[in-house]
């Protein structure tokens, strides 16, 4: 993603990403010279997020909403350069990215939206689900957030094992270099997660349209 079009709008950030960013800034202020142990820091952030009240999370949810609006606004006017439609190679054996809480919620309520509005386009179904999610109280989002956090934890373990296990010889030579870029890569992946999820959701919608006869 870093090597992509510099004019491309920055990916939208989730409420959790804003929270992590705030944590990082706080940490930097308190310990300007200390180096950050990424996995330990992530764990602490995640634990803190889980114990936060709906009120405390609200601030970050508002930031995410505003950033989503900014991203959508910028994407409307963004024209990708020619030939930039190819996706980077993805190993089919790599652990599948975990779904977000919103994605899990969509899986629960998409059948209802599609059933009540049979003529609705994929985009409009997604829009309705987005509205539904935004109108859902924080405590009602919690079961989905808990499940998403569990799946994220599992994914992080799986991806670590996957990375440790199978790298071609050429890659092994660059281990030291790779470690240094790992932190940056993980930050980029956080941004990519959301884009991938949107794509997966569209694919899932298309699959479901084929499966609708079963319902």
């Amino acid at each position: 993603m870093g090597k992509g079009d510099p004019k491309k709008p920055r990916g939208k950030m989730s409420s959790y990403a804003f929270f992590v960013q705030t944590c990082r800034e706080e940490h930097k202020k308190k310990h300007p010279d200390a180096s950050v142990n990424f996995s330990e820091f992530s764990k602490k952030c995640s634990e803190r997020w889980k114990t936060m009240s709906a009120k405390e999370k609200g601030k970050f949810e508002d930031m995410a909403k505003a950033d989503k609006a900014r991203y959508e606004r910028e994407m409307k006017t963004y024209i990708p350069p020619k030939g930039e439609t190819k996706k980077k190679f993805k190993d089919p054996n790599a652990p599948k990215r975990p779904p977000s809480a919103f994605f899990l919620f969509c899986s629960e309520y998409r059948p209802k939206i599609k059933g009540e509005h049979p003529g609705l386009s994929i985009g409009d179904v997604a829009k309705k689900l987005g509205e539904m999610w935004n109108n859902t109280a924080a405590d009602d989002k919690q079961p989905y957030e808990k499940k998403a956090a569990k799946l994220k934890e599992k994914y992080e373990k799986d991806i670590a094992a996957y990375r440790a296990k199978g790298k071609p010889d050429a890659a092994k030579k660059g281990v030291v270099k790779a470690e240094k870029s790992k932190k940056k890569k993980e930050e980029e992946e956080d941004e990519e997660d959301e884009e991938d999820e949107e794509e997966e959701e569209d694919e899932e919608d298309e699959d479901e349209e084929e499966d609708d006869d079963d319902e």
Epitope: A54, F105, S107, E108, Y109, P111, K112, G115, E116, M132, W133, N135, T136, A137, A138, D139, D140, K141, Q142, P143, Y144, K147
Partner: antibody, heavy 120, light 107 residues
């Protein structure tokens, strides 16, 4: 017409178990979050538990957590409440209710209720 | 837990009267406030959701307002079938608590 019909209530001794059922009809059951709300004799309403459309996500009031289990069978259009380690304070009319707006606890349809009496 | 307090607990009124029931939350619940009507021996019936949205089939003499911590249910001109108990409920935070109820009786 939307209908919710509870059954399974009755007299049980403290420490005993009971399983309530709620048969749904008149709507696509698998689209809706459903749950249980109870009302002690002559008292107000108390939310007990909720379950998502697929049955994959559940919520409980602290007063019943670890003792009650909510579940559903979408193929049978039925909601269940397994109640274990029953106490005198669980005595109430148990209503099955549908959440009409996504995961938000707005109960737009209710059953007629089934009475659970916990007494020795 | 969020505590919901209704006032008054009971209310006597006559057909044609305008009545108002107040529901207070001990912390902010935005507009996640719903009103139910219950008649003796029957299940509750949803009247208003999200503070002010009237459910379909509910007469327009019923209305709801408020936000934050204070909410009201108003009945503009009481009809004989309106004599019942009324409950407010917050759907903002688990456990989803109800008010203790207001019993509306014929004077």
């Amino acid at each position: 017409e939307v209908q919710l019909l509870e059954s399974g209530g009755g007299l049980v001794q403290p420490g005993g178990s009971l399983r309530l059922s709620c048969a749904a009809s008149g709507f696509t059951f698998s689209w809706y979050e459903t749950g249980w709300v109870r009302q002690a004799p002559g008292k107000g309403l108390e939310w007990v538990s909720g379950i998502s459309p697929s049955g994959g996500y559940t919520q409980y009031a602290d007063s019943v957590k670890g003792r009650f289990t909510i579940s559903r069978d979408n193929s049978k259009n039925t909601l269940y409440l397994q109640m274990n380690s029953l106490r005198a304070e669980d005595t109430a009319v148990y209503y099955c209710a549908r959440s009409g707006v996504g995961a938000t606890k707005i109960f737009d349809y209710w059953g007629q209720g089934t009475l659970v009496t916990v007494s020795s | 837990d969020i505590q919901m307090t209704q006032s008054p607990s009971s209310l006597s009124a006559s057909v044609g009267d305008r009545v108002t029931i107040i529901c207070r939350a001990n912390e902010r619940i935005n507009t996640y406030l719903n009103w139910y009507q219950q008649k003796p021996g029957k299940a509750p019936k949803l009247l208003i959701s999200g503070t002010s949205s009237l459910e379909s089939g509910v007469p327009s003499r019923f209305s709801g307002s408020g936000s934050g911590t204070e909410f009201t249910l108003s009945i503009s001109s009481l009809q004989p079938e309106d004599f019942a108990s009324y409950y407010c409920q917050q759907s903002y935070s688990s456990p989803y608590t109800f008010g203790q109820g207001t019993n509306l009786e014929i004077r």
